[in-house]
């Protein structure tokens, strides 16, 4: 009679993560008497995957009834496959022995490959805001995919970016892989509404790539432009001076009026107007009683935007052009700002 052979007909099996892998094995004879066991890997450190009679293997089921006297099918199913299950599986016949059973013959092995989807890409931008014309870096990370081949692209508002570097780790063989990419983006004043997109394509995604996004509104700071103007006289001895704060982002802004270097009023931007490009405009005004001044008045609009050093614009008010009212010592009427929307 021919000696028993252990046949594993499949050299390789490819399974998607979460699915069930079927590993086929048959023996050509019932002799010698002894169990079949499944291992992953070879050598003394091999991992026991299934032992018919002993041990706990909750993810493994047999394809046929191994207790049947004439059974020669030792195929198994492994449920809920993960990338960590990848490897070569051996179906091994043992001969009954004392004290321990003795390995008799092994199958040629079946390589289990696991296809695992990448995680949703996570895009993160710089910790601090940057202003237009500056270059900022964005990173994109995705993990847990297999096989290693993967494609990553960067877009800004639908336009593909070319200035980026990508690494897939680890370099050698692994059960699963991670991708890390860094893209450089030049900011413009129009980027408040812009988006940076990281797109990952992998064989497991069937042509439907995963995307991660970052809004440049979280990254950009557009500093304001200031314009101080003198309005027509509203009443005798009174001049209305406005400070128009234009095209700034984000909204966090504090404005201080100074008369000849002395603080007159401080206010925080609240009712702002949003421009089409996402930036904001705001206007503050100051009513100056010129009769309180003997000399010309230097009015300064000082703006602190988003915690940055203050920027200012000044306007010289000529007092000589207006009649002076005796006995008045009020320099300005702080009646609050008229937060009208100026375009």
């Amino acid at each position: 009679e021919e000696e028993l052979q252990v046949i594993q007909p499949d050299k390789s099996v490819l399974v998607a993560a979460g699915e069930t892998a079927t590993l086929r094995c048959t023996a050509t004879s019932l002799i010698p008497v002894g169990p079949i066991q499944w291992f992953r890997g070879a050598g003394p450190g091999r991992e026991l995957i299934y032992n018919q009679k002993e041990g706990h293997f909750p993810r493994v089921t047999t394809v046929s009834d191994l207790t049947k006297r004439n059974n020669m099918d030792f195929s198994i199913r492994i449920g809920n496959i993960t990338p960590a299950d990848a490897g070569t599986y051996y179906c091994v016949k043992f001969r009954k022995g004392s004290p321990d059973d003795v390995e008799f013959k092994s199958g040629a092995g079946t390589e289990l490959s696991v296809r695992a989807k990448p995680s949703a890409p996570v895009v993160s931008g710089p910790a601090a805001r940057a202003t237009p014309q500056h270059t900022v870096s964005f990173t994109c990370e995705s993990h847990g995919f297999s096989p290693r081949d993967i494609t990553l692209k960067w877009f800004k508002n639908g336009n593909e970016l070319s200035d980026f570097q990508t690494n897939v780790d680890p370099v050698g063989e692994s059960v699963s892989y991670s991708i890390h990419s860094t893209a450089k983006v030049v900011l413009t004043r129009e980027d408040v509404h812009s988006q940076v997109i990281c797109e990952v394509a992998h064989v497991t995604l069937q042509g439907d790539p995963l995307r991660g996004t970052a809004n440049l509104s979280e990254t950009i700071r557009v500093p304001p432009t200031l314009e101080v103007t003198q309005q027509p006289v509203r009443a005798e001895n009174q001049v209305n001076v406005t400070c128009q704060v234009r095209k700034f982002y984000p909204q966090r802004l504090q404005l201080t009026w100074l008369e000849n270097g002395n603080v007159s009023r401080t206010e925080t931007a609240s009712t702002v107007t949003e421009n089409k490009d996402g930036t904001y405009n705001w206007m503050s005004w100051l009513l100056v009683n010129v009769s309180a001044h003997r000399d010309d008045v230097k009015l300064t609009c000082q703006v602190e935007h988003d915690g940055q050093p203050a920027v200012s614009k000044s306007h010289d008010l000529k007092v000589s052009a207006h009649p002076k009212e005796q006995g008045s010592n009020t320099a300005a009427e702080n009646t609050g700002s008229n937060e009208r929307n100026i375009y």
């Epitope: 991992e47 002993e54 706990h56 207790t67 004290p99 321990d100």
Partner: antibody, heavy 114, light 108 residues
């Protein structure tokens, strides 16, 4: 539901023999080994031996080898453990367990006393 | 025979504390064959960890197992009142199957 139900407590004299049964249900009796484990009062667990009910093949702990006999009756899905030449140090709880070590009997107390 | 030595024999801790139990084998044991059990007075042992690091069904995630070769560890991250019991390691890598002497985790 997998169950292993053992026979009741026994009191034996030194030199006697005790035979404990372990009736299984909820799975195919021939699918797995049945192990026997001893636990003396206040002591740890000691593996005594096992049987493959499919073919009657047994393995024993050399400590018990000459005194322990493990058998199985596939017609009643029952395993047996017989311990002979009892001595006081055999006073213990005896457990049967399935080959996956998940399912255990409730234990049988054997007291050996003159 | 593979001798399994557990230490410490007794561990006195308070609820909420971390418990680290050691099991050392006299010769190398492949991880697949190293199991841990919990036993409470008057009860049969209950399987906690199989294949050195896999949690058995219904066992809380505060239990974890690690190790390979001759050194294995059972960790209980934060002790609950119901965790005070005796813990055994067990090998079925070779005959005779053996158990460690046990570690009793008691309330301090």
């Amino acid at each position: 539901e997998v169950q292993l139900v053992q026979s009741g407590a026994e009191v034996k004299k030194p030199g006697a023999t005790v035979k404990i049964s372990c009736k299984v249900s909820g799975f195919n009796f021939e699918d797995t080994y049945i192990h026997w484990v001893q636990q003396a009062p206040g002591k740890g667990l000691e593996w005594m031996g096992r049987i493959d009910p499919a073919d009657g093949d047994t393995k024993h702990n050399p400590k018990f080898h000459d005194r322990v006999t493990i058998t199985a009756d596939t017609s009643t899905d029952t395993a047996y453990m017989e311990l002979s030449s009892l001595r006081s140090e055999d006073t213990a709880v005896y457990y049967c367990a399935t080959g996956n070590y998940v399912n255990w009997g409730q234990g049988t107390t054997v007291t050996v006393s003159s | 025979e593979i001798v399994l030595t557990q230490s410490p024999a007794t561990l006195s801790l308070s609820p909420g504390e971390r418990a680290t139990l050691s099991c050392r084998a006299s010769s190398s044991v492949t991880s697949s064959y190293l199991y841990w059990y919990q036993q409470k007075p008057g009860q049969a042992p209950r399987l906690l960890i199989y294949s050195a690091s896999n949690l058995a069904s219904g066992i809380p995630a505060r239990f974890s197992g690690s190790g390979s070769g001759t050194d294995f560890t059972l960790t209980i991250s934060s002790l609950e009142p119901e965790d005070f019991a005796v813990y055994y390691c067990h090998q079925w890598y070779s005959y005779p199957r053996t158990f460690g002497g046990g570690t009793k985790v008691e309330i301090k």
